[in-house]
């Protein structure tokens, strides 16, 4: 006779935990409370991670790689909590952890699969190499291998060079795109599917501005609402390219609302900043101010680059003196 209400034999309850490199995580395990609790956490069914019985830890045979990195929630063991607090996870910690809990009346085994991800904030850089202009999306440390996509004027680009360097525990990735002579807008997206984290870099080229010497110029920089969230920490940097390298004119930190200005002729409008408008003025232009000006708005989730080309021409009177 087949039983009416039955439970099929489930060898182990399995959970997936996703951790971030160098951060602390909790491997969950619960049991029905009981007396004489024994808890053993093991890695890949062989390495001893943590042992507890007779009311205290017994770590004499703990694998050295877990030394000073594990602890239990001691005040909650009597309530059925056998979860493991795990400090500073590394990519080498990835794998299957088994928690054995025994009491005088019950025995359980829980399996926890730990996956570790890395996503150091990517950057979008604008570079000049000889006569060519490049946009480079790069991430210094990422795991697992990310998905990188480029768009030009919101249309996906199939061309996608990826320069990848693998280290022991993560990848370093550069994805350059040649944008020489283009006035289009570009977007690069880097997605870490494990951490469900996406970063977007957007580059916009503004029309060139022609100014006379001694005049002032206003350069606009307003974030695109799709990405920008004023509640999230971000940094705004204005810089000028001279002979292939950028020098910082000024920057603003949203966390402290600090503005640091390195160029005395540069001015920012505080009221506009409060409205998330980072347009700037550069006064008393001289011929050497000709060049490319870059506004970079960056957070953990995006980089918005706006580039202006400024041509400063001699004023009539200067020209007539010459």
């Amino acid at each position: 006779i087949f039983p009416l209400a039955f439970f099929i034999y489930v060898p182990m309850n399995e959970q997936i935990v996703i951790g971030r490199l160098d951060e602390d995580i909790i491997l969950p395990s619960s049991f029905e409370r009981g007396s004489e609790v024994v808890i053993h956490w093991k890695y890949q069914d062989s390495y001893k991670v943590h042992s507890y019985y007779k009311g205290s830890d017994h770590l004499e045979s703990q694998d050295p790689r877990y030394a000073n990195r594990t602890s239990l929630f001691y005040n909650e063991i009597q309530n059925g909590n056998a979860s493991l607090f795990f400090r500073r996870v590394s990519l080498l910690d990835e794998g299957i952890y088994t928690c054995y809990v025994g009491t005088a009346i019950q025995v359980i085994t829980n399996k926890v699969v730990l996956k570790v991800g890395v996503f150091l904030t990517p950057v979008m850089k604008y570079e000049k190499r000889n006569t060519n202009s490049f946009l480079i999306c790069s991430v210094l440390s990422v795991y697992p291998r990310p998905i990188i996509t480029w768009k030009m004027d919101n249309t996906p680009i199939s061309e996608n060079n990826m320069e990848e360097t693998g280290s022991l525990d993560s990848f370093s990735i550069n994805s350059p795109l040649n944008i020489t002579g283009s006035n289009s807008s570009y977007e690069c997206t880097i997605e870490n599917s494990l951490l469900k984290q996406t970063w977007t870099g957007r580059w916009t080229m503004k029309d060139g501005l022609h100014k006379m010497q001694s005049e002032h110029v206003s350069l606009s920089c307003q974030p695109v609402n799709d990405y920008f969230s004023p509640n999230q920490d971000f940094k705004v940097t204005w810089s000028r390219m001279k002979s292939g390298t950028f020098s910082v004119l000024a920057y603003y930190l949203s966390s402290s609302q600090n503005t640091i200005i390195n160029e005395s002729r540069f001015s920012w409008n505080k009221e506009l900043i409060n409205q998330s408008d980072f347009s700037m003025n550069l006064m008393d232009l001289n011929l050497s101010d000709s060049g490319e000006y870059l506004c970079n708005i960056s957070s953990d989730e995006y980089t918005l680059l706006t580039i202006h080309t400024v041509h400063v021409e001699p004023s009539q009177e200067t020209a007539s003196h010459n």
Epitope: V38, Y53, T103, I105, Q106
Partner: antibody, heavy 116, light 107 residues
Framework: EVQLQQSGPELVKPGASVKISCKTS????????MHWVKQSHGKSLEWIGG????????PYNQKFKGKATLTVDKSSSTAYMELRSLTSEDSAVYYC?????????WGQGTTLTVSS | DIVMTQSHKFMSTSVGDRVSITCKAS??????VAWYQQKSGQSPKLLIY???TRHTGVPDRFTGSGSGTDYTLTISSVQAEDLALYYC?????????FGGGTKLEIK
């Protein structure tokens, strides 16, 4: 009084399956893990695995994975063990035993003979 | 898996004698050892757990001791009804494993 009453002896042919029952009384069935232990003739005891009546999950011995399936019927406070693809190696006495990591009450045992 | 070894398959003793049955674990099991008695034609009965804790109703002539890898079940004054097989079991970790058994015979 705690009691674990097992089903009677079984004579089965090689390749067949068999389901042994263990009916309990005298305690709250869902509070304890129910374990199963094999004792081959003239040999020692081998732990097969256990089942927690509340959630169906419990540890088991890898050696018996694919051989034994453990189930419970909470309404009748009965535990079951099904053994499949039987061979002469499976001929033994099988015990159900209540407990956590030690076994404080045992059934009387069910003798299984696998023979053609 | 942890291997439990009972080196003596048989032990012969007389009524009133003191007898010690030994069990060795292949690794430190931190006193997580139980002892069972199995009389002929019967199921095993729990005597001792956590190396030295006597189960309810077990006569006090049965005592357990040991630590690390070496464990002993001692019967201080053997009675005729103690004729049986004795098994040790480690309950330190799964899979739980038993010793091969020691048969106590009365001379």
């Amino acid at each position: 009084e705690v009691q674990l009453q097992q089903s009677g002896p079984e004579l089965v042919k090689p390749g067949a399956s068999v389901k042994i029952s263990c009916k309990t009384s005298g305690y709250t069935f869902t509070e304890y893990t129910m374990h199963w232990v094999k004792q081959s003739h003239g040999k020692s005891l081998e732990w097969i695995g256990g089942i927690n009546p509340n959630n169906g999950g419990a540890p088991y011995n890898q050696k018996f994975k694919g051989k034994a399936t453990l189930t419970v019927d909470k309404s009748s406070s009965t535990a079951y063990m099904e053994l499949r693809s039987l061979t002469s190696e499976d001929s033994a006495v099988y015990y159900c035993a209540r407990g956590g990591y030690y076994f404080d009450y045992w059934g009387q045992g069910t003798t299984l003979t696998v023979s053609s | 898996d942890i291997v439990m070894t009972q080196s003596h398959k048989f032990m012969s003793t007389s009524v009133g004698d003191r007898v010690s049955i030994t069990c060795k674990a292949s690794q430190d099991v931190s006193t997580a050892v139980a002892w069972y008695q199995q009389k002929s034609g019967q199921s095993p009965k729990l005597l001792i757990y956590w190396a030295s804790t006597r189960h309810t109703g077990v006569p006090d002539r049965f005592t357990g001791s040991g630590s690390g890898t070496d464990y002993t079940l001692t019967i201080s004054s053997v009675q005729a009804e103690d004729l049986a097989l004795y098994y040790c079991q480690q309950h330190y970790d799964t899979p739980f494993t038993f010793g091969g058994g020691t048969k106590l015979e009365i001379k």
